[in-house]
Amino acid sequence: QDKPFLSAWPGTVVSEGQHVTLQCRSRLGFNEFSLSKEDGMPVPELYNRIFRNSFLMGPVTPAHAGTYRCCSSHPHSPTGWSAPSNPVVIMVTGVHRKPSLLAHPGPLVKSGETVILQCWSDVRFERFLLHREGITEDPLRLVGQLHDAGSQVNYSMGPMTPALAGTYRCFGSVTHLPYELSAPSDPLDIVVVGLYGKPSLSAQPGPTVQAGENVTLSCSSRSLFDIYHLSREAEAGELRLTAVLRVNGTFQANFPLGPVTHGGNYRCFGSFRALPHAWSDPSDPLPVSVTGNSRNL
């Protein structure tokens, strides 16, 4: 007996209050189906009901979290129904407050190296889920370590490749309610660096400026980079600008830093729009120093 295929659109991780579409596809082309939920709290809107093509479920509540299967209409079967489909686990987020997600030693990871993603919370979560944006497979399930101040998990990811780079979020859950998840952590962009040759970084009017003077950092390369990223040592985040083709055949971006008050070591990276989390080697560091200011960090 042909089993139908059950899928969830846009995915199986759904924010509380949002909608999710459950689609049941029969290889025999029958478009009527029934839905059942195997665990957790009952969902009355599924009972004694025949759906056509797909079902828009929502606004979802914690009660909707659980494992679903569908059976499609099957006129040649004794019961009139197919065998049950594959299971689809719907996880509902926003039930607990969000955990925090960090990368050690940092979110910029050299190609081939390993990064540790640490998800932690002051809530005692026995389970954590790690989810990468744009991936339809189930999130990675991790066992949390409980301690007096809450819980955490460390996940070692590597060797680093563009396939592992992306935007990550983590969620927490408790054992007795495994499909009711916390709100997502703030997103963390994991970037693989060292995939292309390094760009050049220079300063106009120069790397030593008076306090309050304007300085512009120019990042350039003969590679056809679409975007340049400028980062300052010991600072999270980066400035991002689109590259412009110059007359001399280089691709360049100018970062106006405005009136500077303190200096620091700057680096820039190049990347392509099609692979936003895959960057070049860093430029050589450019120390910018500010005179007439004691805070030359």
Epitope: W9, Q18, H19, T21, Q23, N53, F55, L56
Partner: antibody
């Protein structure tokens, strides 16, 4: 600006069907739900059902099951509601509305069509 | 399903009066999941107040909304002639979404 333009009034015979259309403009059709609401003369508002144009997924009020079929054509940004086996109880104004999401659990209908009057009479 | 009961069904008040109408839910509605619509004869409903107390675009500041749990209200601080209409409360906290029976507001 954001608009939902509904098809014109219909006078139909009992037992027949009618298809009401709702053409969206001024926003990304796939990014919002389209809701359908019934209002009988001098009466209140009754939710019929909802369609997500992006996925084709639908949900409906048990009361209208087997009566209303909701579809959407993303190429023309148009939602449709077909009503079958019409009786005098189906004589009403039918509205489409955009289902919008705000904050944490806050769905409301922020833009409404002008309504389509369906009269069922022999 | 969540049943919304509006009271009074019909009310009349003088221009300049303070007017309050209520909406009671049969079970608790999540905070900020209750909305109000205004409808005038021959027209479609208009979103009037969303998420309990936020005024929709173009709605005069004399309107306000409040409430929590199962009890909600819409208040007009000083009634004007253009406020004559039927007002519906609405919840979409649980499927199916439901509307109250409406309060018809008339000018004395």
């Amino acid at each position: 600006q954001v608009q939902l333009q509904q098809s014109g009034a219909e006078l139909v015979r009992p037992g027949t069907s009618v298809k009401v259309s709702c053409k969206a403009s001024g926003y990304a059709f796939n990014n919002y739900l389209i809701e359908w609401v019934k209002q009988r003369p001098g009466q209140g508002l009754e939710w019929i059902g909802v369609i997500n144009p992006g996925s084709g997924g639908t949900n409906d009020n048990e009361k209208f099951r087997g009566k209303a079929t909701l579809t959407a054509d993303t190429s023309s940004s148009t939602a449709y509601m077909q009503l079958t086996s019409l009786t005098s109880d189906d004589s009403a104004v039918y509205f489409c509305a955009r289902g919008n999401y705000y904050g944490t659990r806050d769905w409301y209908f922020d833009v409404w069509g002008a309504g389509t009057t369906v009269t069922v009479s022999s | 399903q969540i049943v919304l009961t509006q009271s009074p069904a019909i009310m009349s008040a003088s221009l300049g009066a303070r007017v309050t109408m209520t909406c009671t839910a049969s079970s608790s509605v999540s905070s900020s999941s209750l909305h109000w619509y205004q409808q005038k004869p021959g027209s479609s409903p208009k979103l009037w107040i969303y998420s309990i107390s936020s005024l929709a675009s173009g709605v005069p500041a004399r309107f306000s909304g409040s409430g929590s749990g199962t009890s909600y209200s819409l208040t007009i601080s000083s009634l004007e002639a253009e406020d004559a209409a039927t007002y519906y409360c609405h919840q979409y906290h649980r499927s199916p979404p439901t509307f109250g029976g409406g309060t018809k507001l008339e000018i004395k």
